[in-house]
């Protein structure tokens, strides 16, 4: 697994007298955003095929208004990188499409409108973990400058992110056939081969030979869909009593979404989920067809069968909405149990489990005693993600390796005196008590409540505990 990162450096008019006017004006201020679509480079896919390696949408750039009479400069860009997570191996050769979109913010009815300004494409060879590669491309009258790289997410390493690095099991060297992971010399390579037949879409592995399922899938090869609870909806914090998500008052009051759009709150504002045939901030844009490129984040656009459904977007995993414009925040449903950290990688949902827990959702309490030995006859007891040893008498410490003072716990009852002995401890009982721990009172008539003492020992003599 890893992340493809794209940095847009500049977008502006190409050189020469025929350079375009700014796409924004005083009457129509606008801002830019970018979309990137990635495909494996050597696949024989059609041009319109989905973004099999992933896709991403940038944030909106700053609002820009053209200064009358001034030449169009490079336009203000969104902050940050476009990041496309990939779950499987990095293919080395990949194809990209980068689109520059304009969002007009004028006073047109219903809010902003979107239009495609430029689109560039290419196929490149790129090793994961290498330096940023730069590119300059022209698209129509515009010129786009950008850099890109692919990097592996730990524990994956290598030019294809197919080798795993794991902490060493032995302090001095790695196992047979496995090399140290430069530059992490204290870690070792581990080959990553999932169980044969493990679903590439719905399964993954972090140990060779396993097949862990993404949320919503089950079965040994993660090919069986799981039905989900009807009460879960990505609206807000979970109710403590029901486990269901409870909506609260906020910016969606009065429903700002036009044309039958449904509103959902975001940390800063609201989002509209638009019916087919409409898009825009408030579902105000209509009459859209696939030619307008309405599907974001690598969504595949298919022409609709009737005028009211001009197009349908088939969204890649991790995105939803009629235009694939919304990233599914699957972590908001707190799927990781036992304190696991949730990571939404776009293509996959991962839980990083606390020590002592495992499984796709950290649902398994590890067999803490597996491979753990308690010395000197101690027995291992599981619990709470950490093992502990119940030590035989005379021994203590985490692994029962330390010789213990058997009298430290004051085992002799009723004022009996404790003596350490090579085989354990001996209690010298106070008058009137008997037993290995002086736990039994002697009857007033001299009869014992116990079976007769072994030959050679009288009641009241020290009872050696064997």
């Amino acid at each position: 697994a890893g992340v493809f990162e794209l940095q847009i450096h500049s977008f502006g008019p190409g050189p020469g007298p025929g350079a375009p006017r700014s796409p924004c004006s005083a009457r129509l201020p606008c801002r830019l955003f970018f979309r990137v679509c990635l495909k494996p480079g050597l696949s024989e896919e059609a041009a319109e095929s989905p973004c099999a390696l992933g896709a991403a949408l940038s944030a909106r750039g700053p609002v820009y208004t053209e200064q009358p009479g001034a030449p169009a400069p490079d336009l203000p860009l969104p902050d940050g990188l476009l990041q496309v997570p990939f779950r499987d191996a990095w293919p080395g050769t990949f194809s990209f499409i980068i689109e520059t979109w304009r969002e007009e913010l004028g006073d047109q009815i219903g809010g902003p409108a979107w239009s495609l300004l430029a689109r560039v494409a290419g196929r490149r060879r790129l090793a994961a973990g290498g330096p940023w590669a730069r590119d300059i491309q022209r698209a129509g009258a515009w010129e786009l400058r950008f850099s890109y790289r692919a990097r592996c997410e730990p524990p994956a390493v290598g030019t294809a992110c197919t080798r795993l690095c794991r902490p060493r099991s032995a302090p001095s060297r790695c196992g047979p056939g496995l090399r140290p992971c430069a530059p992490l010399e204290d870690e070792c390579e581990a080959p990553l081969v999932c169980r044969a037949g493990c679903s590439p879409e719905h399964g993954f592995c972090e140990q060779p030979g396993e097949c862990r399922c993404l949320e919503g899938w089950t079965g040994p090869l993660c090919t069986v869909p799981v039905s989900t609870s009807s009460c879960l909806s990505p609206r807000g914090p979970s109710s403590a009593t029901t486990g269901c998500l409870v909506p609260g008052p906020g910016p969606c009051d009065g429903n700002p979404c036009a044309n039958g759009g449904s509103c959902s709150e975001t940390p800063r504002s609201f989002e509209c989920t638009c019916p087919r045939g409409f898009y825009g901030l408030r579902c105000e844009v209509s009459g859209v067809t696939c030619a307008d490129g309405p599907c974001f984040n690598g969504g595949l656009c298919v022409g609709g069968a009737d005028p009211d459904s001009a197009y349908i977007c088939h969204c890649p995993p991790g995105f939803q909405g009629s235009n694939c414009e919304k990233r599914v925040d699957r972590c908001s449903l707190q799927p990781c149990r036992n304190g696991g950290l949730c990571l939404d990688l776009g293509h996959a949902l991962r839980c990083r489990c606390r020590a002592g827990f495992a499984g796709p959702r950290c649902e398994h309490d590890l067999d803490d005693c597996a491979g753990r030995a308690c010395a000197n006859g101690g027995t291992c007891v599981e619990g709470g993600g950490a093992h502990r040893c119940s030590c035989a008498l005379g021994f203590g410490g985490r692994d029962c390796r330390e010789r213990a003072d058997p009298c430290a716990a004051r085992p002799c009852a009723h004022g009996g005196r404790c003596y350490a002995h090579f085989s354990g401890l001996v209690c010298a009982c106070a008058p009137g008590y008997m037993g290995a721990r002086c736990e039994f009172p002697v009857h007033p008539d001299g009869a014992s409540a116990l079976p007769a003492a072994p030959p050679g020992l009288r009641p009241g003599d020290p009872q050696r505990y064997l």
């Epitope: 499409i97 494409a121 290419g122």
Partner: antibody, heavy 117, light 107 residues
């Protein structure tokens, strides 16, 4: 206006090296890449590689990878292309061109390199 | 490397004619195709980039079209200065590659 001016014609013996220069003017030198393209007599065009004058990053056609070197001097806005281990089939006109990855918008006038024993 | 096949390899036409030259790529190159004009003893000159974008200063009688694998350069009304050799070039993959050229001659 944008201009790329190349060095003069060269005659070389097989096994020798040739170094061709390309001096840029009329634009910000480090803003665009400089590509090298060659054309054998009566033949088509063959891309050799490019240099990014900002980073000095180079990328070459595999056909030339082991024999070509590209360098630049920002103080004079000049790019150099050196081709070693010359063979008779390297006889061609060598062009430099300004551009990005999908356009070569201005070309030098060409430098004729003749390889003959 | 991606191969580009130009046709025809040579063409005779008269001033005022409408001329079409085609370029076919060995695989999908989207719209990453440029057209260059070269006159004898001169360097090539960029006419069209990204399949249909006219370079600054190039007369509007030149136009480009196509995407994917099939592309066309059209000269709507030939002028005397248009007689030259025309090359297509793909810029989708590295290395960029050129077509074999179409020599446009006066009939």
């Amino acid at each position: 206006q944008v201009q790329l001016v190349q060095s003069g014609a060269e005659v070389k013996k097989p096994g020798a090296s040739v170094k061709v220069s390309c001096k840029a003017s009329g634009y910000h030198f480090t803003r665009y890449w400089i590509h090298w393209i060659r054309q054998a007599p009566g033949q088509g065009l063959e891309w050799m590689g490019y240099i990014n004058p900002t980073t000095v990053y180079t990328e070459f056609n595999q056909n030339f990878k082991d024999r070509v070197t590209m360098t630049r001097d920002t103080s004079t806005s000049t790019v150099y292309m050196e081709l070693s281990s010359l063979r008779s089939e390297d006889t061609a006109v060598y062009y430099c061109a300004r551009g990005g990855s999908n356009f070569f918008d201005y070309w030098g006038q060409g430098t004729t390199v003749t390889v003959s024993s | 490397a991606i191969q580009l096949t130009q046709s025809p390899s040579s063409l005779s036409a008269s001033v005022g004619d409408r001329v079409t030259i085609t370029c076919r790529a060995s695989e999908n190159i989207y719209y990453n195709l440029a057209w260059y004009q070269q006159k004898p003893g001169k360097a090539p000159k960029l006419l069209i980039y990204t399949a249909n974008s006219l370079e600054d200063g190039v007369p509007s009688r030149f136009s480009g079209s196509g995407s994917g694998t099939d592309f066309t350069l059209t000269i709507s009304s030939l002028q005397p200065e248009d007689f030259a050799t025309y090359f297509c070039k793909q810029a989708y993959d590295v290395p960029p590659t050129f077509g074999g050229g179409t020599k446009l001659e006066i009939k």
